[in-house]
């Protein structure tokens, strides 16, 4: 079954996918698609890379990490409920039936209503690197400690996002990274 990731309406969603290039700059084509991975490539492609660069993308979908180092995690900007569903990350390793495919389930939750009349900030827009935090514990504490004046609802939302980010890191650290070569 698919690994599940969550985001709220209006935020940026993060879907992790990694591989380790055999050598620096020795990239492998990758595609991201909406829908489970089919036999070849991706269905309803939203982003594609080749051996050198991102060669196809659609609005709101981008790679926030360093894809030249194998971080091909997908960021979806300003999500709506319609963005819910399964996404396919396919790492097209050359050879006979060598493709690695990952189905990731994105669940979009309605945005929380914030009753406080304080100035609102879109966290993922203000802190776009927040969801790509790699470290555990101290790095996350430091991220929380460096936040500007925000309300409790936003802190709660941030904590949830960091929890989901930690899940992504745990997945990566538990062997979801594909090594090539």
């Amino acid at each position: 079954s698919e690994v599940e990731y969550r985001a709220e309406v209006g935020q940026n969603a993060y879907l992790p996918c990694f591989y380790t290039p055999a050598a620096p700059g020795n990239l492998v084509p990758v595609c991201w698609g909406k829908g489970a991975c089919p036999v070849f490539e991706c269905g309803n492609v939203v982003l594609r890379t080749d051996e050198r660069d991102v060669n196809y993308w659609t609005s709101r979908y981008w790679l926030n990490g360093d894809f030249r180092k194998g971080d091909v995690s997908l960021t979806i900007e300003n999500v709506t409920l319609a963005d819910s569903g399964i996404y396919c990350c396919r790492i097209q390793i050359p050879g006979i039936m060598n493709d690695e495919k990952f189905n990731l389930k994105l669940v979009i939750k309605p945005a929380k209503v914030t009753p406080a009349p304080t100035r609102q900030r879109d966290f993922t827009a203000a802190f776009p690197r927040m969801l790509t935090t790699r470290g555990h514990g101290p790095a996350e504490t430091q991220t929380l400690g460096s936040l500007p004046d925000i309300n409790l609802t936003q802190i709660s939302t941030l904590a949830n996002e960091l929890r989901d980010s930690r899940l992504a890191n745990d997945l990566r650290d538990s062997g979801a990274t594909i090594r090539i070569g």
């Epitope: 070849f40 196809y56 050359p94």
Partner: antibody, heavy 123, light 107 residues
Framework: EVQLVESGGGLVKPGGSLRLSCAAS????????MTWVRQAPGKGLEWVSS????????YYLDSLKSRFTISRDNAKNILYLQMNSLRAEDTAVYYC????????????????WGQGTLVTVSS | DIQMTQSPSSLSASVGDRVTITCRAS??????LTWYQQKPGKSPKLLVY???TLAEGVPSRFSGSGSGTQFSLTISSLQPEDFANYYC?????????FGQGTKLEIK
């Protein structure tokens, strides 16, 4: 006009080899996945093998991958299927087909097919 | 492997009839299903892909539906040129697999 023309079929003895070719024209060959599908006399369709745009990724029916090799020459617009250690059960019409494709789609279904070439394996 | 089971295996109908061919997958294939038409001595022709999208140039009397494990191809009003063999094909799991075919004959 898109055209796929297979050749190389014929009568071969069990254990023999054949190389099928599929000459493509009317489209940018290097932009498309290509596939071989076969059909035994009076039977249904069976997928054999597929190859990606640049030939770096290949896919086979498990039971055939030790004997069959798919390849392509994008400079000549030709798709190949090398068949070794042929058996009677490999007797079929072999079709080459183009994987439907545009940016944003996946090439998992086949929009153009050749006329087929008959391979008969018999002693 | 994902097994594709078509029914019926053969069907007799008349010009003007509405006919439906079904295809069942042995596991969930989402909407990754294609329908082909093949006439005797000819190569297959793409009719419908992604379960319900009509291929270019295919008459609107053809329609596809379904998702998951149950799919169907409907011809709303049979024409003489529609008498042929029909195959479904899944493109979710490796290997690609086809149904055994449905032979549509003139009654």
């Amino acid at each position: 006009e898109v055209q796929l023309v297979e050749s190389g079929g014929g009568l071969v003895k069990p254990g023999g080899s054949l190389r099928l070719s599929c000459a493509a024209s009317g489209f940018t060959f290097s932009d498309y996945y290509m596939t071989w599908v076969r059909q035994a006399p009076g039977k249904g369709l069976e997928w054999v093998s597929s190859i990606n745009y640049d030939g770096r990724n290949t896919y086979y029916l498990d039971s055939l991958k030790s004997r069959f090799t798919i390849s392509r020459d994008n400079a000549k617009n030709i798709l190949y299927l090398q068949m070794n250690s042929l058996r009677a059960e490999d007797t079929a019409v072999y079709y080459c087909a183009r994987g439907y494709y545009y940016y944003g789609s996946s090439p998992n279904y086949f929009d153009y097919w050749g006329q087929g070439t008959l391979v008969t394996v018999s002693s | 492997d994902i097994q594709m089971t078509q029914s019926p295996s053969s069907l007799s109908a008349s010009v003007g009839d509405r006919v439906t061919i079904t295809c069942r997958a042995s596991e969930n294939i989402y909407s990754y299903l294609t329908w082909y038409q093949q006439k005797p001595g000819k190569s297959p022709k793409l009719l419908v892909y992604n379960a319900k999208t009509l291929a270019e140039g295919v008459p609107s009397r053809f329609s596809g539906s379904g998702s998951g494990t149950q799919f169907s191809l409907t011809i709303s009003s049979l024409q003489p040129e529609d008498f042929a063999n029909y195959y479904c094909q899944q493109h979710y799991g490796t290997p690609l697999t086809f149904g055994q075919g449905t032979k549509l004959e003139i009654k």
